[in-house]
């Protein structure tokens, strides 16, 4: 149409200038378009250089939009992580504060002379919660063994108790149950509660990490071409008012984000497992009940030891022989038997209930994040045509878009008419992130059954071990020595998204 040859390029000039490009590149009127590499080769207002600039710009705009969407999700996960982490830390700190406030009055020297052992126990629990590769059952067993030796000595200052005698006491301890049921109850409940708490918080960390890493995956050249065609070719071809057809936009973005959509199944599995593990936050083995009440088991244990003192001593002497009397030692002092401490639990304040409710709702909202991403970006960022009619931009001209919308994921892009996708070459970063999601899901499933995946039989298939990016230093794969507290490595941030200072919170 000869009349169209002289059509002005004013609208394109306006758009191109608004993008910050030099207006000297823009022709005054349409020119023949044989030079175009991406847009259809009709009469055009775009030079080769303009086409290249707009292609780069559309690519950058899509990456920005993608990063923005990811940032919103990351921020939500980071906020959740921080809220739960603060709450769990607060529970443990509260328990330790209660112990420090009530034990001196209740147990006198039985506590004050062993305050360090109690402080160390809370430190170990904190380390364990934050992802250190401690064996919780061993940690607790060693705490009770050390405590028994020290308390037995304190209860019998008139006796000489050399190391070999204390070793014998230790061997008898399991059968004698000097602390009553408290150690067993604490072991069972603490294992379940701490495993649930730490795996949930790690799950939030891994999810956030996956989103961050996937947002950095570059979009390929085929995607750049398709997005340019989708967004700017209408301007170049003199139909600047035509908005992209919705289905056309979806096909372009489904092709561009094919690898990301493959995260969907494992992402859903992870989020489902996280919602499920919150069921373990309630009851007498629940997070609030256990983490906030460690001191109550410790109180019950010392109460039991005092109650059982005479029977215990008789049985120890029967099993280990008569210890020598300490000539320098005082006589048995009845004043060491203190009054009992009535254990008070931290009543549920509703904080955890609120956190769980909000987390469940938000995790439900983002379950289909990866597969809904093309639709979300099209509707929010691409100024789509409001109707699938014959007035929208279909990539060639203003008109109806006829091809069907592709399915989700890489395999479904084999016949994508808009983006040439090599379905035999999945993106390796995304494959690695799928694996991290799988690993974290296995960890959560194990935690749901009360098992700590780090300490399951090494003969397992191993698919559940390792924490992916749930730990940001090597503590998750290192057992921390508990024999000497001076040899412990300080934990900075075994949970993602927390700063070094937060990693060393204490009461």
């Amino acid at each position: 149409d000869p009349a169209s040859k002289s059509r002005s390029c004013g609208e394109v000039r306006q758009i191109y200038g608004a993008k910050g490009f030099s207006l000297s590149d823009v022709p005054q009127a349409e020119i023949s378009g044989e030079h175009l590499r991406i847009c259809p080769q009709g009469y055009t207002c775009c030079t080769s250089e303009m086409e290249e600039n707009l292609a780069n710009r559309s690519h950058a705009e899509l990456e920005t939009a993608l990063r923005d969407s990811s940032r919103v999700l990351q921020a939500m996960l980071a906020t959740q992580l921080r809220s739960f982490d603060d709450h769990f830390q607060h529970l443990l700190n509260d328990s330790e504060r209660t112990l420090q406030a009530t034990f001196p009055g209740a147990f006198g020297e039985l506590y004050t002379q062993n305050a360090r052992a109690f402080r160390d126990l809370y430190s170990e629990l904190r380390l364990y919660y934050r992802g250190a590769n401690l064996h919780l059952e061993e940690t607790l067993a060693e705490f009770w063994a050390r405590l028994l030796e020290r308390l037995f000595k304190q209860l019998h200052p008139q006796l000489l108790l050399p190391d070999d005698y204390l070793d014998c006491l230790g061997k008898q301890a399991e059968a004698l149950r000097p602390f009553g049921e408290a150690p067993r109850e604490l072991r069972l409940r603490a294992t379940r509660a701490f495993v649930a708490a730490r795996s949930f918080v790690q799950g939030l960390g891994v999810a956030s990490d996956v989103v961050r890493k996937v947002a950095q995956v570059p979009l390929g050249p085929e995607c750049s071409r398709a997005v340019m065609k989708l967004v700017y070719c209408a301007h170049c071809l003199g139909v600047p008012g035509a908005r992209p057809c919705p289905d056309y936009c979806r096909n372009v973005l489904k092709g561009c984000l094919a690898n990301q959509a493959d995260l969907d199944a494992e992402w859903r599995n992870l989020l489902d497992s996280m919602v499920l593990i919150t069921d373990k936050f309630w009851g007498t083995s629940g997070v609030e009940s256990v983490i906030g009440s460690v001191h109550t088991w410790l109180a019950e244990a010392i109460n039991a030891l005092q109650d059982n003192r005479d029977t215990l001593t008789a049985k120890v002497i029967q099993g280990c022989g008569n210890p020598k009397v300490n000539p320098q030692g005082p006589g048995p002092e009845e004043k060491r038997r203190r009054g009992k401490l009535a254990p008070r639990e931290r009543p549920p304040s509703g904080t955890l209930e609120k956190l769980v409710s909000e987390a469940k709702a938000q995790l439900r909202d983002v379950q289909d994040f990866w597969i809904s991403l093309p639709g979300t970006l099209c509707s929010e960022k691409m100024a789509l045509s409001t109707a699938s009619d014959d007035r929208c931009w279909n990539g060639m001209a203003r008109g109806r878009y006829l091809p069907e919308v592709m399915g989700d994921g890489l395999a479904n892009q084999i016949n994508n008419p808009e983006v040439e996708v090599d379905i035999t070459k999945p993106d390796m970063t995304i494959r690695q992130q799928i694996m991290q999601l799988k690993i974290m899901t296995n960890r959560l499933r194990s935690a749901y059954n009360g098992n700590d995946v780090d300490f399951q039989d090494a003969s397992d298939d191993g698919s559940g071990s390792g924490s992916g990016d749930g730990c940001l230093d090597d503590l998750c794969s290192r057992k921390v020595s508990r024999k000497s507290s001076s040899s412990r490595t300080p934990l900075t941030h075994a949970l993602p998204g927390l700063s070094e200072q937060e990693g060393q919170k204490t009461s």
């Epitope: 408290a182 109850e185 009851g283 007498t284 009940s289 009440s293 639990e345 549920p348 209930e353």
Partner: antibody, heavy 119, light 107 residues
Framework: QVQLQQPGPELVKPGASVKMSCKAS????????MNWVKQSHGKSLEWIGR????????SYNQKFKGKATLTVDKSLSTAYMQLNSLTSEDSAVYYC????????????WGQGTSVTVSS | DIQMTQSPASLSASVGETVTITCRAS??????LAWYQQKQGKSPQLLVY???TLAEGVSSRFSGSGSGTQFSLKINSLQPEDFGSYYC?????????FGGGTKLEIK
């Protein structure tokens, strides 16, 4: 099956104390909280407090602090509630009720012990 | 403390009818609400917890809904054994509080 057995009615004098029991069977006693709930004649229900049988830890409704004391005997799978300085206001049916993993809702209840305070 | 207001205080209905009881919390309790049924001279029985989860062994004629501050219990196709008193209970933060109750009588 889960059962919470409570003793029959109690008639007590004003100013006295009463200790009632709740014997649990059919489940692991230490795995569930034991709650105590008051129901005055023809009235609604009031939560008194709960005890964690695994460690004896207690949480009370502020209104009943000093009035009720909750304890357990693990070896007998039995929870106890002692009410002291009784007045006619304390005449009511007292229920024990188990709560656990159902977000702390009370899924099994005892048949209740009726306490009448009268001189 | 969180106040729980139940309505109506009493209602009469016939076998086969559908009835709805409502419960309002004085502040947001999310989904943490339970419903109990109590028959004359008996102890309460859990029907629904967490707003809408049916307790074990409870007939599917009962259904709970709502969250935040407004909740309801719906009983479809009333049966003779459904008559009695119904209580809602917040199980959000202690002290756990109950509604005043709704007495459901046969018309």
């Amino acid at each position: 099956q889960v059962q919470l057995q409570q003793p029959g009615p109690e008639l007590v004098k004003p100013g006295a104390s009463v200790k009632m029991s709740c014997k649990a069977s059919g489940y692991t006693f230490t795995d569930y909280y034991m709650n105590w709930v008051k129901q005055s004649h023809g009235k609604s229900l009031e939560w008194i407090g709960r005890v964690n049988p695994s460690n004896g830890g207690t949480s009370y409704n502020q209104k009943f602090k000093g009035k009720a004391t909750l304890t357990v005997d693990k070896s007998l799978s039995t929870a106890y509630m002692q009410l002291n300085s009784l007045t006619s206001e304390d005449s009511a049916v007292y229920y024990c009720a188990r709560s656990g993993e159902n977000y702390y809702a009370m899924d099994y209840w005892g048949q209740g012990t009726s306490v009448t305070v009268s001189s | 403390d969180i106040q729980m207001t139940q309505s109506p205080a009493s209602l009469s209905a016939s076998v086969g009818e559908t009835v709805t009881i409502t419960c309002r919390a004085s502040e947001n309790i999310y989904s943490y609400l339970a419903w109990y049924q109590q028959k004359q001279g008996k102890s309460p029985q859990l029907l629904v917890y967490n707003g809408k989860t049916l307790a074990e062994g409870v007939s599917s004629r009962f259904s709970g809904s709502g969250s935040g501050t407004q909740f309801s219990l719906k009983i479809n196709s009333l049966q003779p054994e459904d008559f009695g008193s119904y209580y809602c209970q917040n199980h959000y933060g202690v002290p756990w509080t109950f509604g005043g109750g709704t007495k459901l009588e046969i018309k």
